[in-house]
């Protein structure tokens, strides 16, 4: 009686199990009553990453630096490539297809969460007592200078974008 | 103790201009924040503007900017709100609050004055 | 600028009861930097000037009673009496002070039953 399914790691072909190729190897010939699955190794940036009964291998994954990418994992003949952005730059999507420049937090925000490879900077607003002067994308937000610490006096309060202006004691009204 | 003592409620015309005064006892006048802020009858409370008396630097809503002039004398320990071209409208409680004494991280307001009752009326 | 709404506008509760008022605004008003947030709670009776009940969003301020008790972060926000007093019979208001101006929220009216 022909089998109707196979175990694990077999396919069913012309009415017999056939093992299928370990990953990193494509499928050559299928098995015959006499002979087993003939397999082969993918060959230099190929891969498959699978159990599999594929007659081609995947080709890695090319990290174009022209669009900011660049190899983050090289590929094996059992793995894709798999890309990051260059320095400053994060994926535009979970596939990392093409990189964009990470955004600065203007002055008056600060950065909440620096950009990774995978994420655009998070910025958030400075709130009273704290400050940022600058456009940056690695900046928190700084908290005022305080006065008194100092034995000086405030002449000038702050905002979300300027320090504080500390001054002498006898300058106050 | 810290208090805040306004001076009394006031009539007006429309047109003119008062000045609303809240002097400070029982802490540091010049290095504090005075907010002002008003309740038109029957209305929430609605920020008006600030000022830090030492140094004489000040906030003020956007809505209130032309309207509201916020002095201070560190002398008297008192800080003063001029209200302009007086209307209707401007009918309130008017009420002074400390704000941050200079730590930074004191910007809600512990203390408030009674309140200062402007009716404006022709 | 930073909206403040509060929920409802008008609660009526008896003396024992628990009552919750909620505060939203329209913007985070947590900083990453401190972890804090930028919001107070105040109560005012008829007459008279409001009073400070929580800052920091749950810090109860000295002399306020152990059954009012601020929660919440973020852009959500909660003031509780655990037991209603009679004294407790009120208006409360939200207010946040991240970042100029400061803006209240509308106020919740606490009225007998």
């Known amino acids: 009686e022909p089998p109707t399914a196979c175990r694990e790691k077999q396919y069913l072909i012309n009415s017999q199990c056939c093992s299928l190729c370990q990953p990193g190897q494509k499928l050559v010939s299928d098995c015959t009553e006499f002979t087993e699955t003939e397999c082969l190794p993918c060959g230099e940036s190929e891969f498959l990453d699978t159990w599999n009964r594929e007659t081609h291998c995947h080709q890695h994954k090319y990290c174009d630096p022209n669009l900011g990418l660049r190899v983050q994992q090289k590929g094996t003949s059992e793995t894709d490539t798999i890309c990051t952005c260059e320095e400053g730059w994060h994926c535009t999507s979970e596939a990392c297809e093409s990189c964009v420049l990470h955004r600065s937090c203007s002055p008056g925000f600060g950065v909440k969460q620096i950009a990774t490879g995978v994420s655009d900077t998070i910025c958030e607003p400075c709130p009273v007592g704290f400050f940022s002067n600058v456009s940056s994308a690695f900046e928190k937000c700084h908290p005022w200078t305080s006065c008194e610490t100092k034995d000086l006096v405030v002449q000038q309060a702050g905002t979300n974008k300027t320090d504080v202006v500390c001054g002498p004691q006898d300058r106050l009204r | 103790q810290v208090q805040l003592v306004q001076s009394g409620a006031e009539v007006k015309k429309p047109g003119s201009s008062v000045k609303v005064s809240c002097k400070a006892t029982?802490?540091?006048?010049?290095?504090?924040?005075i907010e002002w802020i008003r309740q038109a009858p029957g209305q929430g409370l609605e920020w008006i503007g600030s000022?830090?008396?030492?140094?004489?630097?000040?906030n003020y809503n956007e809505k209130f900017k032309g309207k509201a002039t916020f002095t201070a004398d560190t002398s008297t320990s008192t800080a003063y709100m001029e209200l302009s071209s007086l209307r209707s409208e401007d009918t309130a409680v008017y009420y002074c609050?400390?704000?941050?004494?200079?730590?930074?991280?004191?910007?809600?307001?512990?203390?408030w004055g009674q309140g200062t009752l402007v009716t404006v009326s022709s | 600028d930073i909206q403040m709404t509060q929920s409802p506008s008008s609660v009526s509760a008896s003396v024992g009861d628990r009552v919750t008022i909620t505060c939203r605004s329209s913007q985070s008003l947590l900083f990453s930097v401190n972890q804090k947030n930028y919001l107070a709670w105040y109560q005012q009776k008829p007459g008279k000037a409001p009073k400070l009940l929580i800052y920091w969003a749950s810090t109860l301020e000295s002399g306020v009673p152990s059954r009012f008790s601020g929660s919440g972060s973020g852009t959500d926000f909660t003031l509780t009496i655990s037991s209603l007093q009679p004294e407790d019979f009120a208006t409360y208001y939200c207010q946040h002070y991240y970042s100029y101006p400061w803006t209240f929220g509308q106020g919740t009216k606490v009225e007998i039953k």
């Open positions: 029982g802490y540091t006048f010049s290095t504090s924040w």
């Open positions: 609050a400390r704000g941050d004494d200079g730590s930074y991280v004191r910007w809600y307001f512990d203390h």
């Open positions: 000022i830090l008396p030492g140094s004489g630097s000040t």
